[in-house]
Structures are given as structure tokens and as C-alpha cells.
């Protein structure tokens, strides 16, 4: 009583000419006339078309004939209900209906599940005009059809600003399961529970889920989809996927790489990036995480002194950006650096050490027993000092740095000399009179400027004056510099 | 997700006639055919009829022609079946549900009762 | 009209146990294009009846796969291998190959 077709229906034929009889609105079948060579035969429907309505949406022509006979009502013809195919197989069916020839426009459109099928859909209409009827045949073909090709398909005819509206013929396409979740990669704790999901859909439901580790099956009897497989842990990493069954076969998940976390390897190719006195910036090339994301590292610092104690300096720093700069360092040193990181499983081993070096650092203190004297014949001003006790890693003394400020009735000028490391005094024009020069000395290494020396303080009067006695810098303990007369 | 809702509980007097609804939601209610199904207490299932709301056309059971009347509004997604002159005998469950693709009745609604009592 | 006549009326089962039931129909439910469009359903009590197996033996989505289907032409089977609690209720075939679509009487499937 169901009409139905099976997914190996073939193409209705091409009718060499109007359907048999007039338009009806009973359930009498379309019988096919005998088939152009070719062609396989017309769907068949059972002769009382159970299942099928006997009245519906019509429309009622108010047009009347020559004899003036009221034309019967238009309805679509009854056609195939239901079609059930395996997915990627092809099928056509059609829409049938018989007009009167007063009907000029007549067109027809297929909708599937309420929303109107336009453009990539291969839909042919033909008409077969007859003297008084044109049978109008509407096809619809899909040539390969996918699930979302599942559906509800009804035609439509505009008439007499009319809708005429067929019965649907309902579209399954079945196939393979299909998957909605699939299993994904974990990263787990050793011998701690986890759980994977697996989820496949028809037509043809149910599905069925198998799930295999390792190649070998994991539940002997099938889940139903959905599947949760709970796994109580590994000790070694495994590789899982689930198997979908349906009545129309069987259907394999991608294989996912379930990872065993472990402490990460240790950094490679730590490097130095750039050093001075007292800090070094270091680079290193993260080691292999052991599936667990890095939290932090620890770069460890020994001074490479065969004579040092042998302790160690230890610095935290986050993960990223793997850079750090070292600080507090001495200058001039040798030092042994490594670096480990962790993760949520532990530290990893520290890296290969490398060895790295400070550079010079500034003179630490500043040129001792500072003595200024104004030379008033040559207009000079003599400055004597005393080198200062340089430490190892101060480096080598390049020379001095001596600043000399003039002020004179609320201007001030400061002036800088260089001086070569060999002397250990300096003379410098007088640049005002009446005027006081104010003196300071640093000591100066590759590694830069060392701290001035406390000022001293000289009167440079106007021309004719006597000549002065020296002023210094005090001796240690004594109050400030004071100009000696 | 596909639903049917049926309207509430009905008492009425023997002769009269009584309408019921059912509201689809979920799925594009013009394409799919609405069935209706009678269950009196304690016994079986019994077909009354379809409709497709689509083009209203309808089918019925021999036993319910002139008992029921199968509607549909499509503006609100709703089928009727009107049952008149009530008698004791019409006093059941009635439920509706959809003809799936898979051309088996796949969704109920939850049923409306009909008393029919003086 | 197809009489559907549904066996046994009432089975007593043990939770866990496997319960079978038939519906016989007069005359063949196979339609001209070899599908055979019958269905069982299960209603519990005060629910709808909600759909378990279609075209004789395919689970809907959702079913169980201790529920299963089988026969042709005439003669129909639903099988539940392991009975559990929430399967208790009437268990109907319904046939829509032919019009009038008929249910068979049913079976109350409960606690031996």
C-alpha cells in the first residue's frame, strides 16, 4: 500500500504522449505506456494506493468549457512515497500533473522540507500537450546522493494565482556511519584514568561502536553510539580508535596518539647572547616537553674559579621567551652556567654546561689625594692625584677622566680633560678669573667610567693676586674638601 | 529538536463536538505527514487518519469518517482533528505523530484525553 | 484490513532474562518494492508510545542494542536479550504497508 522505490529504481520513461484519461482525482495509478527501447518500466503502485489522500488542496478552475461543463479539480498525480538509497547512488523522480490548455503559465518548483530547491538541482520539466490536456512531468535527478540529501520533496505548480501542492515523496539515504565526535589525542598521566568518546550517526541507525587499542579490540561486545570508553591508565603510550557499524557497513575512526607525560628532556644549545661587567643574557633551545607544557626554568650559575667555593647561584624565570639575563655577576669572572625547566611532572636534567665571561667593569673606586694649585705665572691650574687601588676584575686603567667647573658671579661652565694612564697629574688653562674651579678625577677602564672623586674647591682670583697654596682632597676621616690658602 | 505538542485535557458532553491541536516544531511541519492514533483506556492503538499539512490532504480510517475531521494550520505549524457527536465511546487518548522519513510514526506528541460525559 | 495479532498478551520475565514477542499478520506486509513496513514500539505507562524498531529490524536512533527485530512477509519478532526495569511497559507491532494502518493488541512485558 506503501508506494515506495528501492535505491535501484531507474528513470521513469519519456511518454511519447499524454497520460491515459482525463484528469482524476481518485487513486487510480498512472499505468506507463509500453517503454521506449532503452528505458526501464515505470515504477509500478499497487492499484489502490493506500496511504494516499483522496481529497487535499486543489485548485477548483472556474473556467468553464464550449458545453460549459465545470473542469474537474487539478491535483498532482500520485507518485513513488518513499525512496530508500545507499548514499552516492543516483535517482530521479518526478512530479505528474494534467492541465487544461486555457492554462498558459504554468510553472513548476520542487521544495525540499519547507525551503525551495534553485540553481545546482537538475530539474526538467516536459510537457505533453494533447487537444484538450497538457500532462506536465516534472523530474528531479540527484546523480550522487549524500545525507544531506535526506528529505521531504514536494512539487509546486502556480496556476490562476493558485498554489497546487503534491504529496511528498520522502528521500532516505542511507550509508556507512558517519562521525560527529571522533576520539581525540591525549597527553596523560601515567596510570590515571581517562576517557575517550566516539560518536556515528546513520541512516541506517543504530550504530554500533567498537573501540580498538593498539590494533586489538578493545570491548568485545558494541556500544551503542554514543561510546565513552573509559581507559583505567597507561604506562606506555597507545594508539586508539573506534570502529562504526551500521547495517550498511563499517566505518573507522582516525587512530589518535595517546601520550604517556613524563619529565621533559633537558635544553639544548644554551647560549650566550650578550655579556657585560656584572650580567650575561642567555639563550637556550627548549628540550622535548614530555607532552606537558613547560611552567618555568631555572638557569644555574657557578663561578668557573678552580679557587671559588663551589657554590651555586640559582635563577627562576618563566618558560618563555627561553631568554634570561643573568645580573649581580662580577666583572672580569668565569662562570659555568646551565638550565633546566619543568613541567607538571618535574624538572629535567640541567643542560650541557657552557662556560661565559664578564667583561671588565668600571674602576670601583675613585683617584685618591686629589691636590689642585693655581700656577698664576702660566695661568694654570696644576692637579695631582694619587692612582687608586684597582681590583683584578676592574680591568686595566685606560687613563683618567678629570672634571673641572668654573663658576663665576651666577655662571657655571663645566669642562671634561682626558688624561692618559701613565701620569698622575694634570694641568689645565684657567678658563675664568675671580672665579672658583671646582676639580674632580675619575679613573677610566675599558669597562667604563669609575666613580669621581669628592670635589676640591680652588679660588682663581683676579690678575696681580698672590699665588696660593694648594688645595686637596682631605685625608681619610677628615671633614670636607677646604681651600687651602 | 523535533517535538509534537498536543493541547490539554478535554471533558465534554455527549453530542458535542470537541477540537484538538497539536503544534509541530523542530522540522519544516509542510513536509512531513501528521497521523493521528486513538487509545482508549487500558486498550490498544487504534489509526484514525493522516494529513499532510503541506497541501491538507488527508486520508482516513472507514471507522472515523464523519467522526473526525483532519485540519492543519500551517501559518502556526498546528494540526486539528475535530471530533463530533461525542459519545462514551469516544472517550479516550488521542495522540498525533509524524510519518519520519523512515516512514514509521518516529515522534508522539504526549497525548491529549477526551472525557465525553454528562 | 491487516488484523495484526500480537503473542503473548502478557509475558512475565526475570530482570535480565530474554524476552521474545510475535506479531502475526493476515496477510504479507512486504510492498511491491520488497520493503516490509512494519514496526514495534514501546509504551510506558503514562507516555506516548515512543518508536524501537523500524522496517522489521532496524533500531531507531537511540535504541538499545539489546533490542532486535526480525522476520518477513507475515510472521515478526522483537527480541530483548537482557530485560532490564526500564523496558517494563506494552510493547506494540504496527504495520503501515496497507491501509488502514493497524497495531497489533499488545504486549505488557513485566516482573515475573
Known amino acids: 500500500a506503501i508506494t515506495e522505490a528501492r535505491e535501484e529504481a531507474k528513470p521513469y520513461p519519456l511518454f511519447p504522449g499524454p497520460f491515459p484519461g482525463s484528469l482524476q482525482t481518485d487513486h487510480t495509478p498512472l499505468l506507463s505506456l509500453p517503454h521506449a527501447s532503452g528505458y526501464q518500466p515505470a515504477l509500478m503502485f499497487s492499484p489502490t494506493q493506500p496511504g494516499r489522500p483522496h481529497t487535499g488542496n486543489v485548485a477548483i478552475p472556474q473556467v468553464t468549457s464550449v458545453e460549459s461543463k465545470p473542469l474537474p479539480p487539478l491535483a498532482f498525480k500520485h507518485t513513488v512515497g518513499h525512496i530508500i538509497l545507499s548514499e552516492h547512488k543516483g535517482v530521479k523522480f518526478n512530479c505528474s500533473i494534467s492541465v487544461p490548455n486555457i492554462y498558459q503559465d504554468t510553472t513548476i518548483s520542487w521544495w525540499k522540507d519547507g525551503k525551495e530547491l534553485l540553481g545546482a538541482h537538475h530539474a526538467i520539466t516536459q510537457f505533453y500537450p494533447d487537444d484538450e490536456v497538457t500532462a506536465i512531468i516534472a523530474s528531479f535527478s540527484i546523480t550522487s546522493v549524500q545525507r544531506s540529501d535526506n528529505g521531504s520533496y514536494i512539487c509546486k505548480m502556480k496556476i490562476n494565482n493558485e498554489e497546487i501542492v503534491s504529496d511528498p515523496i520522502y528521500i532516505e539515504v542511507q550509508g556507512l556511519p558517519h562521525f560527529t565526535k571522533q576520539p581525540e589525542s591525549m597527553n596523560v598521566t601515567r596510570n590515571t584514568a581517562f576517557n575517550l568518546t566516539c560518536q556515528a550517526v546513520g541512516p541506517p541507525e543504530p550504530v554500533n561502536i567498537f573501540w580498538v587499542q593498539n590494533s586489538s579490540r578493545v570491548n568485545e561486545q558494541p556500544e551503542k553510539s554514543p561510546s565513552v570508553l573509559t581507559v583505567p591508565g597507561l604506562t606506555e603510550m597507545a594508539v586508539f580508535s573506534c570502529e562504526a557499524h551500521n547495517d550498511k557497513g563499517l566505518t573507522v575512526s582516525k587512530g589518535v596518539q595517546i601520550n604517556i607525560k613524563a619529565i621533559p628532556s633537558p635544553p639544548t644549545e644554551v647560549s650566550i647572547r650578550n655579556s657585560t661587567a656584572h650580567s650575561i643574557l642567555i639563550s637556550w633551545v627548549p628540550g622535548f616537553d614530555g607532552y606537558s607544557p613547560f611552567r618555568n626554568c631555572s638557569i644555574q650559575v657557578k663561578e668557573a674559579d678552580p679557587l671559588s667555593n663551589g657554590s651555586v647561584m640559582i635563577f627562576n624565570t618563566s618558560a618563555l621567551p627561553h631568554l634570561y639575563q643573568i645580573k649581580q655577576l662580577q666583572a672580569l669572572a668565569n662562570y659555568s652556567i646551565g638550565v633546566s625547566c619543568m613541567n607538571e611532572i618535574g624538572w629535567s636534567a640541567v643542560s650541557p654546561w657552557i662556560l661565559a665571561s664578564t667583561t671588565e667593569g668600571a674602576p670601583s673606586v675613585a683617584p685618591l689625594n686629589v691636590t689642585v694649585f693655581l700656577n698664576e705665572s702660566s695661568d694654570n691650574v696644576d692637579i695631582r692625584w694619587m692612582k687608586p687601588p684597582t681590583k683584578q676584575q676592574d680591568g686595566e686603567l685606560v687613563g683618567y677622566r678629570i672634571s673641572h667647573v668654573w663658576q663665576s658671579a651666577g655662571i657655571s661652565k663645566e669642562l671634561l680633560e682626558e688624561v692618559g694612564q701613565n701620569g698622575s697629574r694634570a694641568r689645565i688653562s684657567v678658563q675664568v678669573h675671580n672665579a672658583t674651579c671646582t676639580v674632580r678625577i675619575a679613573a677610566v677602564t675599558r669597562g667604563g667610567v669609575g666613580p669621581f672623586s669628592d670635589p676640591v674647591k680652588i679660588f682663581i682670583p683676579a690678575h696681580g693676586w698672590v699665588d696660593y697654596a694648594p688645595s686637596s682632597t682631605p685625608a681619610p676621616g677628615n671633614a670636607d674638601p677646604v681651600l687651602i690658602i | 529538536q523535533d517535538q509534537l505538542q498536543q493541547s490539554g485535557p478535554e471533558l465534554v458532553k455527549p453530542g458535542a463536538s470537541v477540537k484538538i491541536s497539536c503544534k509541530a516544531s523542530?522540522?519544516?511541519?509542510?513536509?512531513?505527514?501528521i497521523h493521528w492514533v486513538k487509545q482508549r483506556p487500558g486498550q490498544g492503538l487504534e489509526w484514525v487518519g493522516w494529513?499532510?499539512?503541506?497541501?491538507?490532504?488527508?486520508k482516513y480510517n472507514e471507522r472515523f469518517k464523519g467522526k473526525a475531521t483532519l485540519t492543519a494550520d500551517t501559518s502556526s505549524s498546528t494540526a486539528y482533528m475535530q471530533l463530533s457527536s461525542l459519545t462514551s465511546e469516544d472517550s479516550a487518548v488521542y495522540y498525533c505523530?509524524?510519518?519520519?522519513?523512515?516512514?514509521?510514526?518516529?515522534?508522539w506528541g504526549q497525548g491529549t484525553s477526551v472525557t465525553v460525559s454528562s | 484490513d491487516a488484523v495484526m495479532t500480537q503473542t503473548p498478551l502478557s509475558l512475565p520475565v526475570s530482570l535480565g532474562d530474554q524476552a521474545s514477542i510475535s506479531c502475526r499478520s493476515s496477510?504479507?506486509?512486504?510492498?511491491?518494492?520488497?520493503?516490509?513496513?512494519l514496526h514495534w514500539y514501546l509504551q510506558k505507562p503514562g507516555q506516548s508510545p515512543q518508536l524501537l524498531i523500524y522496517?522489521?529490524?532496524n533500531r531507531f536512533s537511540g535504541v538499545l542494542d539489546r533490542f532486535s527485530g526480525s522476520g518477513s512477509g507475515t510472521d515478526f519478532t522483537l527480541k530483548i536479550s537482557r530485560v532490564e526495569a526500564e523496558d517494563l511497559g506494552v510493547y506494540f507491532c504496527?504495520?503501515?504497508?496497507?491501509?488502514?494502518?493497524?497495531f497489533g493488541s499488545g504486549t505488557k512485558l513485566e516482573i515475573k
Open positions: 496477510q504479507s506486509l512486504e510492498n511491491s518494492n520488497g520493503n516490509t513496513y
Open positions: 494529513i499532510f499539512p503541506g497541501n491538507g490532504n488527508t
Open positions: 523542530g522540522y519544516s511541519f509542510t513536509s512531513y505527514y
Open positions: 505523530a509524524r510519518l519520519g522519513l523512515i516512514y514509521a510514526l518516529d515522534y
Open positions: 522496517r522489521v529490524s
Open positions: 504496527l504495520q503501515v504497508t496497507h491501509v488502514p494502518f493497524t
